[in-house]
């Protein structure tokens, strides 16, 4: 067979001759690549548009279920049921009544455990005899704690005024043992439900100065739409304590975030909030009950810069001139000031309620559930933006004895800061925690 000299077939080829010429790469790209690129770009555009629509919808609208429809986000938590099933009023600040008396409490006398006899209404000190880890856990669970407690024996003091009884457990509540004889050990139960109130650094006693998060690892910034609104205090891995009035303008839970672990306002990641709970409002005392608990979506991991502060003891009565500390990112001047970027700290002292209620001061507005703190000559005070933050007292540990609440102006000599007295709300705090366990 003669070979066609014009043939494209190589001489050594054993291949069958192609029926048509192969496409050059440019032609293939034009016919296959371009449509794929166009399809991918279209898909990317659609995805971007969908994401943008979703972002815009999420920012400005809320999706109601059954039937599916959108309502403006400003209608969330406005006190009106705008969704047929009322979901728009679901994730809002909720109120919780004070509830029944919690039948256990801890005294400032070495954190000793006291138990209520509900039949008589009398309180008794817990004897260390036969006191177990299980009983310690029950006591702490009654106060709403979920962490592992520690306890030890402490000697009965000479000024022990309550009867001392042996303790038992009945349907997950501590009870007095019926046949309780004398306390043979001669010791009371000192109970700690949570390791709290310890910081890496002790503050120096000066006027107002920049603070370090090492000194105040429980301080948080409570923010709405990334803007600092209030301070707050970490009480345990799930809970932050603050003031109810912080949520006055925005009662939806969605946009509130908590920032912990830094003394600089903008520099730390935000934590999602699951619930915001305030105490049932009493119309007769509208300034009372300025207290709120924020439940975090995920528990905090404690570290050197993120730690809880202790709640006060039920009998924590602070006398006038007792030294206390305040911290916050609030206004540095009463008028025309701006929020501080750096956490500030100051030493103040308890101011007698009678003095605080005088005619040239608060004229009787400071109730038994509030306390005043400042310095007699004025000039050192909490201000706008400090609200919700802690008023702190140091014994063995740091305790949050007050919550920054209200005042006339900032730093006036006759009108010091007014604080929610935390010890007046221990029962409410424990009842909230128990309900959320």
């Amino acid at each position: 067979m003669l070979q066609d000299p014009d043939s494209d077939q190589p001489l050594n080829s054993l291949d069958v001759k192609p029926l048509r010429k192969p496409r050059i790469p440019m032609e293939t790209f034009r016919k296959v690549g371009i449509p794929i690129i166009i399809a991918l770009l279209s898909l990317a555009s659609i995805i971007i548009v969908v994401v943008l629509i979703k972002v815009i919808l999420d920012k400005y609208y809320f999706l109601c279920g059954q039937p599916l429809h959108f309502i403006p986000r400003k209608q969330l938590c406005d006190g009106e049921l705008d969704c047929p099933l009322g979901e728009d009023e679901e994730h809002c600040v909720k109120s919780f009544p004070e509830g029944p008396a919690v039948a256990v409490r801890l005294s400032k006398d070495r954190s000793t455990l006291q138990v209520l006899d509900s039949a008589t209404g009398n309180w008794f000190s817990a004897c260390f005899d036969n006191f177990t880890e299980a009983l310690a856990e029950t006591a702490c669970r009654q106060m709403g704690y979920s962490s592992k407690p520690t306890f030890r024996a402490v000697e009965i003091g000479p000024d022990q005024d309550l009867d001392v009884v042996e303790i038992t457990e009945n349907s997950q509540e501590l009870r007095m043992r019926n046949s309780s004889g004398p306390c043979l050990s001669g010791s009371l139960v000192s109970l700690h439900c949570l390791a709290c109130g310890k910081s890496l650094k002790t503050p120096r006693v000066v006027g107002v100065e920049e603070a370090s998060v090492d000194s105040w690892p429980w301080q948080v910034s409570i923010q709405y739409d990334k803007q600092h609104v209030c301070g707050g205090s970490i009480l345990d891995p799930h809970w932050v304590l603050t003031a109810a009035h912080c949520f006055r303008k925005h009662t939806d839970v969605f946009n509130w975030k908590v920032r912990a672990g830094s003394d600089k306002l903008g520099s730390f990641p935000s934590l999602a909030v699951a619930k915001i709970i305030i105490i049932e409002f009493n119309p007769m005392y509208p300034k009372d009950n300025d207290i709120a608990l924020m439940k975090l979506q995920f528990p905090l991991t404690f570290s050197g810069t993120v730690r809880p502060i202790c709640l006060p003891f039920f009998d924590e009565e602070l006398t006038p001139a007792t030294p206390l500390w305040i911290i916050g990112w609030g206004f540095t001047k009463q008028n025309g000031g701006k929020m501080s970027d750096i956490l500030l700290q100051a030493s103040v002292q308890v101011i007698d309620s009678t003095r605080c209620n005088a005619d040239d001061a608060y004229q009787g507005e400071v109730t038994e559930k509030m306390m005043c703190a400042g310095i007699p000559e004025g000039g050192v005070d909490t201000c706008q933006g400090d609200s919700g933050g802690p008023l702190m007292y140091q014994s063995d540990q740091w305790h949050v004895v007050g919550i920054v609440s209200w005042g006339y102006g900032c730093g006036g000599p006759s009108t010091p800061g007014v604080y929610t007295k935390v010890s007046a709300y221990l029962n409410w705090i424990y009842n909230v925690w128990k309900a959320e366990l």
Partner: antibody, heavy 123, light 107 residues
Framework: EVQLLESGGGLVQPGGSLRLSCAAS????????MHWVRQAPGKGLEWVSS????????HYADSVKGRFTISRDNSKNTLYLQMNSLRAEDTAVYYC????????????????WGQGTLVTVSS | DIQMTQSPSSLSASVGDRVTITCRAS??????LAWYQQKPGKAPKLLIY???SLQSGVPSRFSGSGSGTDFTLTISSLQPEDFATYYC?????????FGQGTKVEIK
């Protein structure tokens, strides 16, 4: 839409009794404190009584203390005012009113009112 | 109880007029003051709270100002539907107390 609808008003003799009801809808009734406020013919508004969201706190004006009883049933979304030993000066339109959730001071501001029910005390 | 005094007790005005009503408290109520509008045979309606905050859905021609003991409600341009009686209420101290009302009539 928030709605408060009062009922139970009417003509009663001095010393008689009436029970006013207020049916609430369009909001989470159990989350709000409520007031009763009255308005005598041609006169201004006068606060009568308040009740907190879970009935923990109850308050009365001195003029009705011991004679009127405020209560609520959150399961029925209803507020009540039991009025005993009625006097001529209790003649008024009685409004059921929702206390706005303005946390902190100023919390006894009313954000919604019912249409009112007329109570006439006359022999 | 804190006494609330409104002035004037009545006024006549025309559509488009600027109307000002004042309310004075017998002692400081800070900014805890509300203004309500009531039309004959109707329930009162909240216009202003916290002395100057406009309630949702209320026209912007209504504005409030003041703090302490002296407060003002202003209607920048009176409309036909604004002819009504206006009440102030303090919410600082319990019990809540109301002014005696200001009736705005057509001139």
């Amino acid at each position: 839409e928030v709605q408060l609808l009062e009922s139970g008003g009417g003509l009663v003799q001095p010393g008689g009794s009436l029970r006013l009801s207020c049916a609430a809808s369009g909001f989470t009734f159990s989350s709000y404190a409520m007031h009763w406020v009255r308005q005598a013919p041609g006169k201004g508004l006068e606060w009568v009584s308040s009740i907190s969201s879970s009935s923990t706190y109850i308050h009365y004006a001195d003029s009705v203390k011991g004679r009127f009883t405020i209560s609520r049933d959150n399961s029925k979304n209803t507020l009540y005012l039991q009025m005993n030993s009625l006097r001529a000066e209790d003649t008024a339109v009685y409004y059921c009113a929702r206390v706005g959730r303005y946390y902190g001071s100023g919390s006894s501001l009313v954000d919604y009112w019912g249409q009112g029910t007329l109570v006439t005390v006359s022999s | 109880d804190i006494q609330m005094t409104q002035s004037p007790s009545s006024l006549s005005a025309s559509v488009g007029d600027r109307v000002t009503i004042t309310c004075r408290a017998s002692q400081s109520v800070s900014s805890w003051l509300a203004w309500y509008q009531q039309k004959p045979g109707k329930a009162p309606k909240l216009l202003i709270y916290d002395a100057s905050s406009l309630q949702s859905g209320v026209p912007s021609r209504f504005s409030g100002s003041g703090s302490g003991t002296d407060f003002t409600l202003t209607i920048s341009s009176l409309q036909p539907e604004d002819f009504a009686t206006y009440y102030c209420q303090q919410a600082k101290s319990f019990p809540p107390t109301f002014g005696q009302g200001t009736k705005v009539e057509i001139k």
